[in-house]
């Protein structure tokens, strides 16, 4: 199921910035999603559950995000996404076991002079 | 116990490079230790155990390392450690449960002209 996750639109554009969507299987209950810009961790979101199914979200890098039951979307301004960077969604699954780490979708994003002019996407296997 | 781990010498110097020590509690049996250079993951080491207490080590970034029952030391050459970078040890504890993630010690390291001249350490709480 994890291998199917690359077949989605990773980048979408809104005023002044970029939304980067990182999909994961709906069966995953507890996870960490990291967004890499080249080798740098740009965003880091961890969702865990307490004994009463209460949900805890940790977002130490304070990235604007949106979380659903099968995706995490991070919102970047153009400064974060310029210079033709390679972005990668990296998923750690805590629950259900076993613990797994997967590099999901990845793509190049090129923005010139704050105009969203070109987008070249390369999907990782 | 995790809060006591900052009270150790994080950096030590040897010919041509730096040893960065990331301490963890002796009670931790299965773990992942990541070394961050600023926001970049420089090293990533995972230790898990089999049924007969055999140990499996995964080191996908092929960092030279030394592992004991309470620390992981990564060996970097000066190229990796130059330009006044901030280094951080990040620990994920798998065993004993429950799963935890902790940022351990962190410190700035400044190296000029391959001479180990100054070291300013800032310990994170």
């Amino acid at each position: 199921e994890l291998n199917d996750l690359a077949n989605h639109r990773m980048f979408s554009f809104h005023d002044g910035g970029v939304q980067i969507s990182c999909n994961y299987p709906e069966t995953v209950q507890q996870l960490k999603m990291q967004l890499f810009k080249d080798r740098e961790v740009l965003c880091d979101l961890t969702k865990t559950k307490g004994s009463g199914n209460t949900v805890s979200i940790k977002n130490p890098m304070s990235c604007p995000y949106q979380l659903s039951n099968n995706s995490v979307s991070f919102f970047l301004d153009n400064a974060d996404s310029s210079q033709g960077s390679y972005f990668l969604c990296s998923l750690s699954i805590f629950d259900p076991p076993p613990f797994q780490e997967k590099n999901l979708s990845g793509g190049y994003l090129l923005i010139y002079e704050s105009q969203l002019c070109c987008q070249l996407k390369l999907w990782l296997p | 116990e995790l809060n006591d781990l900052a009270n150790h010498r994080m950096f030590s110097f040897h010919d041509g490079g730096v040893q960065i020590s990331c301490n963890y509690p002796e009670t931790v049996q299965q773990l992942k230790m990541q070394l961050f250079k600023d926001r970049e993951v420089l090293c990533d080491l995972t230790k898990t155990k089999g049924s007969g207490n055999t140990v499996s080590i995964k080191n996908p970034m092929s960092c030279p390392y030394q592992l004991s029952n309470n620390s992981v030391s990564f060996f970097l050459d000066n190229a990796d450690s130059s330009q006044g970078s901030y280094f951080l040890c990040s620990l994920s504890i798998f065993d004993p449960p429950p799963f935890q993630e902790k940022n351990l010690s962190g410190g700035y390291l400044l190296i000029y002209e391959s001479q180990l001249c100054c070291q300013l350490k800032l310990w994170l709480p």
Partner: antibody
């Protein structure tokens, strides 16, 4: 849906051999340590042995009661676990369960419904 | 091999009663102890792992405590559906089960 289905049980004479299979589906079989546990009629649970994952070189470990007579193997490409039982004794009569366990980062296991092995002359 | 003992071997209690089972290991197993429930004709079900952590979907009336060699399993308020045999299991070194405790209703 997670499933572990044991097969291969039946009646065998003392000194004979039998091979049990356990077909797994619905989870990542190759990531789990696979155990065999047995239960003699009206008795308690008894651990038989385990085979670890590829990361641990498929290491096997056995209880003293079966060591040297039983062999556990696995085929990750077929999602199947095996138990080869040789030199069977009457006291090996039991329901044999295969179980899949993992301990990182949560202890977790799946059990099959078991297959009955009867050793009798 | 690590040996596990359990007591009592059986008990009868009323609905709503607090039920306690003890388990002892022949050597220090730290907290690597789990508890299973088995109903007649069924496979065992994991209730508790690492001495006191509840497995997913297990009601909070079940609890565990202890460390080292001495462990306790408690049902705070016995329900009719709790009629079963309960086993402790060490997983510090391979696996060993206790002999079981059969719980029924008075």
């Amino acid at each position: 849906e997670v499933q572990l289905v044991e097969s291969g049980g039946g009646l065998v004479k003392p000194g004979g051999s039998l091979r049990l299979s356990c077909a797994a589906s619905g989870f990542t079989f190759s990531d789990y340590f696979m155990h065999w546990v047995r239960q003699a009629p009206g008795k308690g649970l008894e651990w038989v042995g385990v085979i670890d994952t590829k990361s641990f070189n498929y290491a096997t470990y056995y209880s003293d009661l079966v060591k040297g007579r039983f062999t556990i193997s696995r085929d990750d490409s077929k999602n199947t676990l095996y138990l080869q039982m040789n030199s069977l004794k009457t006291e090996d009569t039991a329901v044999y369960y295969c179980t899949a366990t993992i301990a990182v980062p949560y202890y977790f296991d799946y059990w099959g419904q078991g297959t009955l092995v009867t050793v009798s002359s | 091999d690590i040996q596990m003992t359990q007591s009592p071997s059986s008990l009868s209690a009323s609905v709503g009663d607090r039920v306690t089972i003890t388990c002892q290991a022949s050597q220090d197993i730290s907290n690597y102890l789990s508890w299973y429930q088995q109903k007649p004709g069924k496979a065992p079900k994991l209730l508790i792992y690492y001495t006191n952590l509840l497995a997913e979907g297990v009601p909070s009336r079940f609890s565990g405590s202890g460390s080292g060699t001495d462990f306790t399993f408690t049902i705070s308020s016995l329900q009719p559906e709790d009629i079963a045999t309960y086993y402790c299991q060490q997983y510090y070194n391979y696996r060993t089960f206790g002999p079981g405790t059969k719980v029924d209703i008075k």
